[in-house]
């Protein structure tokens, strides 16, 4: 005999999240980013895979490419030429690193309703793009750049020295892709397609990381990647520009490097075209506290690029590294010489500045104890940007418009009051001349994408509101989330706490700290997520906390640069401090506290477990860094300097996980890593394991064969199932 269900009680029809829900992606959300093709038109791939053109002003739409055509070549992506005559169709996607992939490309002629035959593109292609005007094609094949004047024409080969793992043209090498650009491409068309700029990376002298890829063969194969670790030889970069109308006339012309940069090891950080005959390059010293922005002009008489010293703008940090995570990029105004850029103001907050002649004379556009985060668009009369100013929550993002046509400039928050409870974290996508824009809200409520008039900011329509997700969540007991702050010794520690649905302050709960904590990162954000930690709170009754300590972003340079040259100290201290504060709140079972993290978070969780505080019963490190000598030069040296005696070798040695092996004796430690991790090499975990074995310290470990830093596919399910068992065992929760 079973009791009949009480239908009028909401509690009885509600269920907790299951691990299966998370692994199946049952509660994933959709966003809508229009593929803008003009001021008022955009393309979108419909649910049934047709490519549809939407005209905002008429409210009408029509299909320009049928799903039948897409399916005929198994296309997973497309790109319309600016003259609207052709579409490239991308298939056979094969992932390489974080952004890079190779693919097969077919060109479809819209006017004739057929694929372009003759002079087909080679395969697989590493990168392909249309010119900004017309239908010229630039592509990279086998590390060389090719140009087609029209899709059916034979290609013109621009570079000839490309060689696998040695010379990269038009695409970055591993370290530039991951840590500097960060993109899959390194070529840039001028605004009207007259010129094509590209980078050449010479990796001939870079040491190679080699690891086994087991596959199914009798013998594993070896993956070799030129990968500069801290202090190692770096790629040598050169920038060239070629006239695409007459490419054979003078050939590629090298752009000179500023003298103050070229005097020692340096990086190229970005290229921005201003006009067809003016280009802006950004360079960075290897010791990344000096950046130079160089504006170069085409000399018609010599067919060369001239970069006068008077057009060099220096950005320097005296308290840390230049920029935030990356040095910011300029957004040029219509006069084609002045620009807007985000950098630290005198109070140590990142703000928008207007540079007309020199950086010293920059006019500060935004100011306050908050940070400007991104400049989306500058038009004749408006500048659109995002910041975390509103209500002083650093983990929010709102979109603002500053009128630059009038004086004094007036500021308006476009998003602050739109859907205040649901939406506090926005990004935006603008059409040509900012005639219209899409807002994508990521939370804290269910994400929603909307279309707006660029003049009035009026909402025109909802593009995606995730109705299905909303309905699916109606009978789910989601955890409660709080974002609050702790004030400790003049440091503000923002935290997010995820609480079980029936949370009762008078009870005691196990606590799991989820940490990332890397320089210029932010974990405490007002975004929507139904993920593994949501399940742990909803079903397993855990309290989960995320804490942004020293080194994290968007709260000023004092917090950000606190970790400069000293990684692995304050990030860990601040997690520990927060845990002590959480215990004081009275609802944490101090005998059941765990910490886990991935990547940089794995490093911090390992150091926290080995801190000797006795606070943590157990913890997990997924793909952790274990010594900064093992990680990439560009990233590591930005924050740590060089691992040399006369620089910062001592702290490189002090900050390893291996040095703390003894301290793992009194905690339960689960160490996890993919054997084919191109980013944080398996070497890191291998060395932790070796040190623990040598110290005769017991620990648990799991490796994922042939998996990279993301541990994707079936490994994901195995990983989260394994970590769940580990935590439930640690917290004495029944299975």
């Amino acid at each position: 005999l079973r009791p009949s269900r009480v239908h009028n009680s909401e509690e009885n029809t509600m269920r907790a999240l299951t691990l299966k829900d998370i692994l199946n992606g049952t509660f994933s959300y959709k966003t809508f980013f229009p593929n803008w093709i003009s001021g008022q038109e955009y393309l979108h791939q419909s649910a049934d895979n047709n490519i549809v053109l939407y005209n905002i002003e008429t409210g009408q739409s029509y299909t320009i490419l049928s799903n039948r055509t897409m399916k005929s070549v198994n296309a997973s992506n497309y790109g319309l030429s600016p003259d609207r005559q052709f579409v490239y169709l991308e298939s056979d996607y094969s992932k390489l690193w974080r952004y890079s992939y190779t693919a097969t490309y077919y060109i479809y002629d819209l006017s004739n309703g057929e694929f372009v035959r003759g002079n087909e593109l080679p395969r697989p292609i590493q990168y392909l793009c249309w010119s900004p005007v017309g239908s010229k094609l630039a592509y990279v094949y086998q590390n060389n750049i090719y140009l087609k004047q029209r899709p059916g024409d034979p290609p013109f080969q621009i570079t000839f020295n490309g060689r696998e793992n040695k010379i990269f043209n038009g695409i970055p090498d591993w370290v530039y892709e991951e840590e500097m650009l960060p993109t899959k491409y390194a070529l840039w068309w001028s605004p009207n397609g007259k010129f094509l700029a590209y980078a050449e990376f010479n990796d001939k002298d870079i040491p190679v990381i080699a690891y086994s890829y087991y596959g199914d063969e009798q013998y594993p194969r070896t993956i070799n990647i030129p990968y500069p670790k801290a202090g190692a030889k770096n790629p040598v970069v050169r920038i060239f520009i070629i006239d695409t109308t007459y490419p054979a006339y003078v050939g590629p012309q090298e752009v000179p490097v500023p003298a103050m940069i070229a005097s020692s090891d340096y990086y190229f950080s970005w290229l921005t075209w201003v006009t067809d005959e003016r280009v802006c390059l950004q360079w960075l010293k290897r010791v990344q506290n000096v950046s130079v922005l160089s504006i170069c002009d085409f000399r018609e008489d010599w067919q060369t690029w001239d970069c006068p010293k008077t057009q060099e703008h220096i950005e320097e940090s005296r308290t840390g590294w230049a920029g935030g995570f990356f040095v910011s990029r300029p957004v040029f105004s219509y006069d084609a010489i002045s620009y807007y850029k985000i950098f630290s103001d005198k109070d140590g907050y990142k703000h928008i500045h207007y540079i007309k002649d020199t950086v010293e004379n920059a006019i500060q556009i935004t100011s306050g104890k908050w940070e400007a985060i991104n400049i989306f668009r500058v038009t004749q009369d408006s500048l659109f940007y995002s910041s975390n100013e509103f209500e002083e929550y650093p983990g929010r993002r709102n979109i603002y418009r500053i009128s630059i046509g009038s004086y004094p400039p007036s500021k308006k928050c476009v998003t602050c009051h739109l859907r205040k409870e649901r939406c506090q974290y926005y990004t935006a996508s603008f059409s040509d001349y900012a005639k219209y824009y899409a807002l994508v809200c990521y939370g804290p409520g269910i994400p929603i994408s909307t279309l707006h008039d660029g003049r009035t900011d009026q909402e025109i329509k909802i593009l995606e509101e995730n109705k299905e997700l909303e309905n699916a969540l109606k009978n789910i007991q989601l955890p409660k989330e709080e974002i609050k702050k702790l004030e400790v010794d003049e440091i503000t520690l923002w935290y997010k706490m995820i609480l079980p649905p029936q949370f009762d302050r008078s009870k005691k709960y196990p606590l799991l700290i989820q940490v990332y904590g890397g320089p210029c990162s932010q974990s405490v954000r007002s975004v929507f997520a139904v993920n593994w930690i949501s399940y742990l709170a909803s079903k397993e009754g855990m309290v989960i906390a995320l804490v942004d300590g020293r080194g994290t972003a968007f709260q000023g340079d004092k917090l950000l640069y606190a970790v400069y040259r000293k990684l692995g100290v304050y990030e860990v201290e601040d997690q520990i401090t927060a845990v002590r504060k959480f215990i004081e709140m009275g609802f944490i079972d101090e005998k059941r506290i765990a910490i886990w993290g991935w990547s940089y978070g794995g490093y911090v969780s390992s150091l926290a477990l080995a801190s000797g505080t006795g606070l943590f019963k157990c913890g997990i490190a997924v793909a952790p860094v274990s010594s900064w000598e093992y990680y990439a030069s560009v990233y590591t040296e930005r924050f740590m300097g060089l691992p040399t005696k006369d620089d910062n070798l001592e702290h490189y040695k002090n900050s390893t996980v291996m040095a703390r092996a003894e301290y793992f004796r009194n905690v339960d430690y689960l160490l996890i890593h993919g054997t084919a991790d191109d980013n944080v090499h398996f070497q890191n975990s291998a060395q932790i394991a070796k040190a623990l074995v040598n110290a005769q310290v017991d620990f648990q470990a799991m490796w994922y064969s042939d998996q990279n830093h993301g541990l994707s596919g079936l490994s994901t399910n195995h990983l989260y199932t394994h970590m769940t068992h580990f935590l439930k065992q640690c917290f004495s929760l029944s299975d």
Epitope: S38, G39, Q40, E41, L53, N55, E57, T58, Q60, Y62, T63, I64, L65, S66, T69, L80, R84, Q85, L110, S111, G113
Partner: nanobody
């Protein structure tokens, strides 16, 4: 239902001029990007000129400086003014949205340029 009716073609001597018209119904031409296309015997159809819903225009290299695309909003009509015509301009000329829909073309109007 969108309908496009091209007219104004004919036989003309090299160096001469023609003005093609396209009566548009079912959509407002001024609010849509529209284009003129042509197909020469034994050749593929190609874009001749495109006119954005603003004022932006695109011309094929072969006709730049000789052809002008325009429209009359009141009449919902698209035009192509063709000057300094050459024998290689001989083709059937079509108007359509720009880019064209995947499944619709009008009848077109024949332009023949004799030398």
């Amino acid at each position: 239902q969108v309908q496009l009716q091209e007219s104004g073609g004919g036989l003309v001597q090299a160096g001469g001029s023609l003005r093609l018209s396209c009566a548009v119904s079912g959509i407002i031409s001024s609010m849509n990007a529209m284009g003129w296309y042509r197909q020469a015997p034994g050749k593929r159809r190609e874009l001749v000129a495109g006119l954005g819903s603003g004022v932006s225009t695109t011309y094929a290299d072969a006709v730049k400086g000789r052809f002008t695309i325009s429209r009359d909003n009141a009449k919902n009509t698209l035009y192509l003014q063709m000057n300094s015509l050459k024998p290689e301009d001989t083709a059937v000329y079509y108007c359509n949205r720009w880019p064209p829909p995947y499944d619709y073309w009008g009848q077109g109007t024949q332009v023949t340029v004799s030398s």
